[in-house]
């Protein structure tokens, strides 16, 4: 159940231009390489669903309502997307600028067995997550401008991500 699920965009504007790629600094050790840094002249799809934000070939949905992590992931799945994989500093800054003072779940989870953080695409995350000592298994971004460990059962807003069409 997802009451009042709205996008963050005000007018549902869908861009129609074709955007090239800006090169991203090499931070593969921390974030993992992402496709936005590997093909500098690539053209992306630019069409996003209404109320989704377009950025560098991706569409992002910022919820207004709050849900536990699993429900957030399930919601993204119903939209043909996943929780956001924030694997470059540029992407992190872009999403945090929109997030403002709110905290949003992203697609990063702790793997208790090997005591590592992994993205939901299974690639390893070697950066810093704050509040790790709290034994929280999920992560939010937003208010603190860092990756914050958070309880998966507590309700937060969330960010979905999909490729632009």
């Amino acid at each position: 159940y997802f009451p009042q699920v709205f996008g963050k965009s005000n007018d549902g504007f869908v861009p129609t231009e074709s955007y090239g790629t800006t090169s991203v600094q090499n931070v593969s050790q921390i974030f993992g390489r992402n496709d936005e840094s590997t093909m500098p002249t690539r053209s992306y799809g630019t069409v996003c669903p209404r109320n989704w934000d377009f950025h560098q070939g991706k569409c992002f949905f910022f919820s207004f309502s709050e849900s536990p992590w699993k429900d957030s992931m399930d919601y993204c799945a119903t939209q043909g997307s996943t929780l956001a994989i924030v694997n470059t500093p540029e992407k992190l800054k872009y999403l945090q600028d929109i997030a403002g003072i709110e905290n949003y779940f992203i697609g990063l989870v702790r793997q208790p067995g090997e005591k590592k953080w992994r993205w939901i695409n299974n690639s390893v995350f070697n950066g810093n997550v704050t509040n790790q000592d709290q034994n929280f298994d999920c992560v939010t971004i937003g208010l603190t401008k860092t990756y914050d460990a958070a309880s998966c059962e507590v309700s937060y807003r969330w960010i979905c991500e999909m490729n632009a069409k």
């Epitope: 593969s28 993992g32 390489r33 992402n34 496709d35 590997t38 992590w69 699993k70 992931m73 799945a77 996943t82 929780l83 994989i85 697609g107 990063l108 989870v109 702790r110 793997q111 208790p112 067995g113 090997e114 953080w117 992994r118 993205w119 939901i120 695409n121 299974n122 690639s123 390893v124 298994d137 999920c138 998966c152």
Partner: antibody, heavy 125, light 112 residues
Framework: QQQLEESGGGLVKPGGTLTLTCTAS?????????MCWVRQAPGKGLELIAC????????WYATWVNGRFTISRSTSLNTVDLKMTSLTAADTATYFC?????????????????WGPGTLVTVSS | DIVMTQTPASVEAGVGGTVTIKCQAS??????LAWYQQKAGQRPKLLIY???TLASGVPSRFKGSGSGTEYTLTISGVQPDDAATYYC??????????????FGGGTEVVVK
């Protein structure tokens, strides 16, 4: 000591049905694990069949399975079953049970760090 | 589906020599790659994960490297006990919806 043990293999006729069981010991399914079945035909490579997230039961199947196989788990018995139907000679293989760590909700899984010894399934008339 | 192409299918090495096995993914798998060793009639054994991290108890003569679509397993100072078939495995899942893992075809290492 953490272990996996497969059982239920044997000779089955083409078109037949067989259920394999993987019994885990030394760890609990209530924790975050992804349990999978992998098979290996004689002299061939490894092929992933199906996986199940131990705590929630969320499943994944290889596309070629086409509904012939069903994976399930019992948290009380610490077992994972693979029910195989409409078997053909091409299904003749050693079937391994394998475990991967997983993160919350069954996401953030990875490599297989624990394997069973395997059980041989022979499909022949 | 991501396809893993492993080369060569077979390689021969002398004791003390070096063996290099390559694994190519059909798309970027972001270092989500494991290597396994399987001896005849036995279960596979994890050697390396996340492309370059040595699994517990694995000798340091095994080394994993690579990124993007190209990955390599190097065995330095080959021992008779290293005679086995080696498999790479991708566990990158671009959809976040299921396993999507794929094994390479395997490389048989023969030690002379």
């Amino acid at each position: 000591q953490q272990q996996l043990e497969e059982s239920g293999g044997g000779l089955v006729k083409p078109g037949g049905t067989l259920t394999l069981t993987c019994t885990a010991s030394g760890f609990s399914f209530s924790s975050s694990y992804y349990m999978c079945w992998v098979r290996q035909a004689p002299g061939k490579g490894l092929e992933l069949i199906a996986c199940i997230y131990s705590s929630s039961g969320r499943t994944w199947y290889a596309t070629w399975v086409n509904g012939r196989f069903t994976i399930s788990r019992s948290t009380s018995l610490n077992t994972v079953d693979l029910k195989m139907t409409s078997l053909t000679a091409a299904d003749t293989a050693t079937y391994f049970c394998a475990r991967s760590y997983a993160g919350y909700g069954g996401y953030g899984y990875a490599y297989f760090n624990l394997w069973g010894p395997g059980t041989l399934v022979t499909v022949s008339s | 589906d991501i396809v893993m192409t492993q080369t060569p299918a077979s390689v021969e090495a002398g004791v003390g020599g070096t063996v290099t096995i390559k694994c190519q993914a059909s798309e970027d798998i972001y270092s989500s790659l494991a290597w396994y060793q399987q001896k005849a009639g036995q279960r596979p054994k994890l050697l390396i994960y996340d492309a370059s991290t040595l699994a517990s108890g694995v000798p340091s003569r095994f080394k994993g490297s690579g990124s993007g679509t190209e990955y390599t397993l190097t065995i330095s100072g080959v021992q008779p006990d290293d005679a086995a078939t080696y498999y790479c495995q991708n566990y990158y899942d671009s959809t976040g919806s299921g396993y999507g893992a794929a094994f390479g075809g395997g490389t048989e290492v023969v030690v002379k």
